[in-house]
């Protein structure tokens, strides 16, 4: 490598001198000089500053609004922002995760594929062939029509993805 | 204030390696680099490397390539300057200093030298 | 490697004379170069940088010169505690490299 043509990774330029940026979880007071360092003070209590910088302003961290379903997942520190997710049957409606919206149920005929989360909503799939939902769920799964030979019985009403099969006895002929 | 203060002075038989270490205080560690110069007893000023002590990244001079390693520790503020197979031609006074940068028009930008560490002596005996 | 050959590599003045020292490069180095000042058992303290800015502080008595290939280190009225050894440094390309030295003693 050559000498710098610019200020180092971790500088800034100012008044022709290359200053040291403020690390993390600290706000630039003053520039340095000639004679003088970078002077840099940690953010406050509910502030943070998350990458090398020459901020005079810490940023606040987010605030996790029970009013729009949210709480928080992880505290912010100097160096990060508070994380909030959803309330319980709740989710995210960005990643940003700024509100929260119910999680979907799926209709009859439909299962769940994957049960929400904080930040994902349900995710439903159509009942396959020989598979049925008769309710509307958040967690139900799509169940197997139920088996009639293994009990000794018949079909009597056929399923459908939203109902399950009837069973009957055999009909027994008489001699 | 900032200053960097380096280890004590070393005897080291010929052969054997020598570690010097030099404290920074008083100023953000990551954001200059740290470079090493030695004076051999009677002798001028020689430029051996610098160190990024952010990423680690190193740049030696030619002639010391292969026998010196700078490392350092950003948990105590703390470069390392270590010079292995070690020849009596080697005694000198090694100094770490930070480095600063002035913008000196266009792309100039002037490499200057502050401050310095004390100086650790180190004697090579064969 | 950039070769500073420094001159004179001593000399003797005494308090009030003017002293000019020498530092050429083996190649151009526009005015990438600074200029040191060492008393014995310390480190070295910067003077002057690129070649012709004084380094705040720095009595007005110093001053530099040159650019390209030439450069000169001036004292214009030497002072008691002027006595010491002066460097150029090279700052144009890697290795950095320092001159020989100039040591300043009194006459």
């Known amino acids: 490598p050559e000498p710098p043509t610019a200020c180092r990774e971790k500088q800034y330029l100012i008044n022709s001198q290359c200053c040291s940026l403020c690390q993390p979880g600290q706000k630039l007071v003053s520039d340095c000089t000639e004679f003088t360092e970078t002077e840099c003070l940690p953010c406050g209590e509910s502030e943070f500053l998350d990458t090398w910088n020459r901020e005079t302003h810490c940023h606040q961290h987010k605030y996790c609004d029970p009013n729009l379903g949210l709480r928080v997942q992880q505290k912010g520190t100097s160096e990060t922002d508070t994380i909030c997710t959803c309330e319980e049957g709740w989710h995210c409606t960005s990643e940003a995760c700024e509100s929260c919206v119910l999680h979907r149920s799926c209709s009859p005929g439909f299962g769940v594929k994957q049960i929400a989360t904080g930040v994902s909503d349900t995710i439903c799939e159509p009942c396959p062939v020989g598979f049925f939902s008769n309710v509307s769920s958040a967690f139900e799964k799509c169940h197997p029509w139920t088996s009639c030979e293994t009990k000794d019985l018949v079909v009597q009403q056929a399923g459908t993805n939203k109902t399950d099969v009837v069973c009957g006895p055999q009909d027994r002929l008489r001699a | 204030q900032v200053q960097l203060v380096q280890s004590g002075a070393e005897v080291k038989k010929s052969g054997a390696s020598v570690k010097v270490s030099c404290k920074a205080s008083g100023y953000t560690f990551a954001g200059y680099y740290i470079h090493w110069v030695r004076q051999a007893p009677g002798q001028g000023l020689e430029w051996m490397g610098w160190?990024?002590?952010?990423?680690?990244?190193?740049n030696y001079a030619q002639k010391f390539q292969g026998r010196v390693t700078m490392t350092r520790d950003t948990s105590i503020s703390t470069a390392y300057m270590e010079l292995s197979r070690l020849r009596s031609d080697d005694t000198a006074v090694y100094y770490c200093?930070?480095?600063?940068?002035?913008?000196?028009?266009?792309?100039?930008?002037?490499?200057?030298?502050?401050?310095w560490g004390q100086g650790t002596l180190v004697t090579v005996s064969s | 490697d950039i070769q500073m050959t420094q001159s004179p590599s001593s000399l003797s003045a005494s308090v009030g004379d003017r002293v000019t020292i020498t530092c050429r490069a083996s190649q151009g180095i526009r005015n990438d170069l600074g200029w040191y000042q060492q008393k014995p058992g310390k480190a070295p303290k910067r003077l002057i940088y690129p070649a012709s800015s004084l380094q705040s502080g720095v009595p007005s008595r110093f001053s530099g010169s040159g650019s390209g290939t030439e450069f000169t280190l001036t004292i214009s009225s030497l002072q008691p505690e002027d006595f010491a050894t002066y460097y150029c440094l090279q700052h144009n390309s890697y290795p950095l490299t320092f001159g020989g030295g100039t040591k300043v003693e009194i006459k």
């Open positions: 200093a930070r480095e600063r940068l002035t913008h000196c028009g266009g792309d100039c930008y002037s490499q200057w030298f502050d401050p």
């Open positions: 160190i990024n002590p952010d990423s680690g990244d190193t």
